[in-house]
């Protein structure tokens, strides 16, 4: 044997190298791959170093047992059978509330007779719940709504007003409140006629009415 | 009627391991994920982590990750906890909670645990 | 992780007075969960999904809310309502509960 060289690299098994016939002069390169469904366990990457030695001890391709890690899907949290994803394991995807599954909740890694393992599908996605909206209420009687849409999304508010001479009776908004079914904060309210009892009842005044034959008071009802 | 018998208060010495078990009954146990909480002497509630009966799945608050360990067993319908490299900071009450579709929705009695030198 | 902030810490009521408490969240969430503890026992689930009642929970009691603002109120107040209670969401995980409202009777 050459004494100016660095020893013959052998072949692998389940992987192979290159360049196939090296050059085994100092700075040469030499790179170890496996065959799919093997990984490379120790340095792939082996240099003819002055010493005439390679730089690293000779590889070896090792069977893959286990899955590459999903990841996490956005929204939600999961829950994993093993930690390292042997073949068998299972991943399951819970989305969070509020969030729909979009895809498999469950991930098992299978084996493959050739290749690595791999599991049964994608990883799924968490999408935001569509919320429907609330029906458009009627206006009051002798009164108005705004806005006049038919449906308003959830979180929206629409606002009630009345007529001259009509006194709201209730919430004068309310609001879509997101939920499954949405649904409105509290009833429509209503347009009552503004009566000189309430106005005056409303201010705990005491009014002396005037004789029955000349009273505008009561002419005002 | 939906049971969860937890095991009795412990006294632990700091950098010990202790494991705590709740016993599910009155119901398919494979069917409802348990879940552990924490409740410290402050009386906040903190979730650890939950685990599925049935596939052994396991998922862990990123804060309990190294502390608790979660495990089951379906022949006896029992959930297990195992937290490890105790310090004061582990004196609480720890509940196991049957999962109730994004709350809990039973509780066990809690078991007490005490770690002082 | 999303914070819960209840409001107030702690509170005391008269029998049949009305009663609100308020849980506040650090970011917008789908539904608040509520749960009752009393002195030496476990929580338990006392409103779900914002606004559900759990089982045996008297129709006084009830819930609402949406976005980051959520609510429990007790139309009036007896004295077995006395105790702790604690808003809880999953909207994000890790679930998160409140720091708690003690309520106390008059």
């Known amino acids: 044997p050459r004494n100016d060289t660095c020893p013959e690299l052998p072949e692998i098994p389940n992987g192979w190298k290159s360049p196939s016939q090296p050059e085994l002069v100092h700075g040469t390169v030499v790179t170890y791959q496996c065959y799919p469904g093997y990984q490379v366990v120790g340095s792939s990457v082996l240099m003819c170093q002055w010493d005439l030695t390679w730089s690293e001890d000779l590889p070896s391709c090792q069977r893959v047992t286990s899955c590459h890690d999903p990841g996490d899907v956005e929204h939600s949290r999961r829950l994993i059978s093993s930690p390292k994803f042997p073949v068998g394991a299972t991943v399951q995807y819970i989305c969070d509330q509020g969030f729909v599954l979009m895809g498999s909740s469950i991930l098992t890694c299978h084996d493959r007779q050739a290749g690595s393992p791999k599991w049964s599908d994608r990883a799924p996605k968490c999408l935001l719940e569509q919320l429907k909206p609330c029906h458009g209420l009627s206006a009051p009687e002798n009164g108005a709504r705004s806005p006049e849409k038919q449906l308003h999304p959830a979180g929206a508010t629409i606002h009630f007003s009345c007529a001259p001479g009509y006194v709201l009776k209730g919430q004068a908004s309310i609001k879509c409140v997101p939920g499954h079914p949405s649904h409105w904060s509290d009833p429509p309210p209503i347009c009552r006629a503004a009566s000189l009892d309430g106005f005056y009842n409303s201010r705990s005044l005491d009014v002396a009415k005037a004789p029955a034959a000349s009273s505008t008071l009561d002419a005002a009802h | 009627e939906v049971q969860l018998q937890q095991s009795g208060p412990e006294l632990m010495k700091p950098g010990a391991s202790v494991k705590m078990s709740c016993k599910a009954s009155?119901?398919?146990?494979?069917?409802?994920?348990m879940h552990w909480v924490k409740q410290n002497q402050g009386k906040s509630l903190e979730w650890i982590g939950e685990?599925?009966?049935?596939?052994?799945?396991?998922g862990y608050n990123q804060k309990f990750k190294g502390k608790a360990t979660l495990t089951v067993d379906k022949s006896s319908s029992t959930a297990y906890m195992d937290l490890r490299s105790l310090t004061s900071e582990d004196s609480a009450v720890y509940y196991c909670?049957?999962?109730?579709?994004?709350?809990?929705?039973?509780w066990g009695q809690g078991t007490t645990l005490t770690v002082s030198s | 992780q999303i914070v819960l902030t209840q409001s107030p810490a702690i509170m005391s009521a008269s029998p049949g007075e009305k009663v609100t408490m308020t849980c506040s969240a650090s970011?917008?969430?789908?539904?608040m969960h509520w749960y009752q503890q009393k002195s030496g026992t476990s929580p338990k689930r006392w409103i779900y999904d914002t606004s559900k009642l759990a089982s045996g929970v008297p129709a006084r009691f009830s819930g609402s809310g949406s976005g980051t603002s959520y609510s429990l109120t007790i139309s009036n107040m007896e004295a077995e309502d006395a105790a702790t209670y604690y808003c809880q969401q999953w909207s994000s995980t890790p679930p998160t509960f409140g720091g708690g409202t003690k309520l106390e009777i008059k």
């Open positions: 685990v599925n009966p049935n596939t052994g799945g396991i």
């Open positions: 009155g119901y398919i146990f494979t069917d409802y994920n």
């Open positions: 970011s917008s969430i789908s539904y």
């Open positions: 909670a049957r999962d109730g579709n994004y709350c809990f929705d039973y």
